[in-house]
């Protein structure tokens, strides 16, 4: 029951996280005009990964896409790539995890296969979350660097009579959405990996020897679950028994439909 709950919760958390990563990637407010010195501005600038926007205080908003590909900063391209990789991995992870959910029965899919898929989706969610966090962090670092550079320019370029106000940019809402979403996806992935460890023992936590129906060959299994991950084909259609010696863990285990040849 706890395994099902952990897996289900991991799936839901990852789903929310990936939705957040998609939202952050699409948002226009990755960087917003710094209003520290001028809280009320007649023209407000903000930028996303795909376009930059200007909102005038009268209500008019105009956005322009970055129609060039080669002319964009390499860092921006890298952030785009990281976010897209995160979304793609997350989407595939979601697809895999749907089939891996313990509460969903698909044909005669074995628990070992479900455990395998749960681990795979968990790893995908972890990488997806890391990609999003990395992408957002790279962009944030770029903003911090540019912020202090423009601040330095502001105070060195005041010699003339005519003032040219340089626009400084600070963290936009999309960065916080991205960080939170990446974190949630990461947490969801970890939960899926934990659930996978709970799924696998159902088939492989019987200890001692492996007994074939023919009764001619006997293979001794010394380590039980700790010696074998349960993802190999050696567990398929085999009766695993313990000769009467049960561990505390095994008291709760019941035969699955593949335990008998």
């Amino acid at each position: 029951m706890a395994v099902t709950a952990c897996q289900g919760l991991g799936f839901v958390v990852s789903l929310i996280g990936i939705a957040g990563i998609i939202a952050a990637t699409c948002m226009d407010q990755w960087s917003t005009q710094d209003l520290y010195n001028n809280p009320v501005t007649a023209v407000f600038n903000y930028q996303g990964l795909w376009r930059s926007c200007v909102r005038e205080s009268s209500g008019f908003t105009e956005c322009r896409g970055y129609f060039t590909l080669l002319g964009l900063p390499a860092m921006l391209q890298a952030v785009r790539a990281l976010m897209i990789v995160g979304i793609v991995l997350g989407a595939i992870g979601l697809l895999v995890s749907i089939f891996a959910l313990k509460c969903i029965r698909i044909g005669s899919m074995e628990d070992s296969a479900k455990a395998n898929m749960t681990l795979t989706s968990g790893i995908m969610f972890i990488v997806s979350g890391l990609c999003a966090i990395a992408g957002v962090s790279v962009f944030a670092n770029m903003l911090v660097t540019n912020f202090w550079m423009s601040t330095a320019n502001m105070y060195t370029g005041m010699g003339g009579m005519v003032q040219t106000v340089q626009t400084r940019y600070t963290f936009g809402a999309a960065l916080f959405v991205g960080w939170v979403a990446g974190g949630l996806t990461l947490i969801g992935g970890v939960m899926m990996c934990i659930a996978c460890r709970g799924l696998a023992p159902e088939e492989t936590n019987y200890k001692a020897v492996s007994y074939h129906a023919s009764g001619h060959s006997v293979a001794y299994k010394p380590g039980g679950f700790k010696a074998s991950t349960g993802f190999g084909s050696n567990t398929k259609n085999k009766k695993i028994y313990d000769g009467g010696a049960r561990t505390e863990d095994e008291v709760q285990s019941y035969p699955s439909k593949h335990d008998y040849v």
Partner: antibody, heavy 118, light 113 residues
Framework: QVQLQESGPGLVKPSETLSLTCTVS?????????WNWIRQPPGKGLEWMGY???????NYNPSLKSRITISRDTSKNQFSLKLSSVTAADTAVYYC???????????WGQGTLVTVSS | DIVMTQSPDSLAVSLGERATINCKSS????????????LTWYQQKPGQPPKLLIY???TRESGVPDRFSGSGSGTDFTLTISSLQAEDVAVYYC?????????FGQGTKVEIK
């Protein structure tokens, strides 16, 4: 096309409060515009006084900030100007105007002359 | 506040001739976000409210004759009437639309010589 019409008393006594209303037709006051008050003393230039925007936020000229209030009544499709403690220097033609793209005043009322005199 | 200074204060031009009005701002009106200059030009005829001619320094408002054109960037701007007509006699104002409070130039009176 949006049309604007100012209304209010043409004569106000010094130290009293000047109150004007602008009625909007051909458009909603809740639409994505800013609704401004601009004044022009006789024979002089234009002075922007302040606005109330589509979301109800106001912004005033600092030179008038302590005396000015702009509000709106969405049910009547009107917005209003209140200017307290008036003096003879506040005698002017008062215009209401709509600003949008480029923060430019695209529609104007005909203007109403307000004289401050005892 | 941004101070807008127009020159000349008045201008007499023959019909069909070119009229040029200058406007200088005390700060740059160029917005780096969209590379647009937030300067607007208005025409005001006697007894009438001002009429929008040009916004973003060079974009003509719909319905405005193409003899009116705006140019300039940063702090220096120009309104040009390529061929002055009798109906162009008016006072012309430039406006800072970039920074609060929005401010106007003192106006330039255009007359026929």
């Amino acid at each position: 096309q949006v049309q604007l019409q100012e209304s209010g008393p043409g004569l106000v006594k010094p130290s009293e409060t000047l109150s004007l209303t602008c009625t909007v037709s051909g458009g909603s006051i809740s639409s994505n515009y800013a609704w401004n008050w601009i004044r022009q003393p006789p024979g002089k230039g234009l002075e922007w006084m302040g606005y109330i925007n589509y979301s109800g936020n106001t912004n005033y000229n600092p030179s008038l900030k302590s005396r000015i209030t702009i509000s709106r009544d969405t049910s009547k499709n009107q917005f209003s100007l209140k200017l307290s403690s008036v003096t003879a220097a506040d005698t002017a033609v008062y215009y209401c105007a709509t600003s949008y793209y480029g923060n430019s005043f695209i529609y104007w009322g005909q203007g109403t002359l307000v004289t401050v005199s005892s | 506040d941004i101070v807008m200074t127009q020159s000349p204060d008045s201008l007499a031009v023959s019909l069909g001739e070119r009229a040029t009005i200058n406007c200088k701002s005390s700060q740059s009106l160029l917005n780096s976000g969209n590379q647009k200059n937030y300067l607007t030009w208005y025409q005001q005829k006697p007894g009438q409210p001002p009429k929008l001619l040009i916004y973003w320094a060079s974009t003509r408002e719909s319905g405005v004759p193409d003899r009116f054109s705006g140019s300039g960037s940063g702090t220096d701007f120009t309104l040009t009437i390529s061929s002055l007509q009798a109906e162009d006699v008016a006072v012309y104002y430039c406006q800072n639309a970039y920074s609060f409070p929005w401010t106007f130039g003192q106006g330039t009176k255009v007359e026929i010589k």
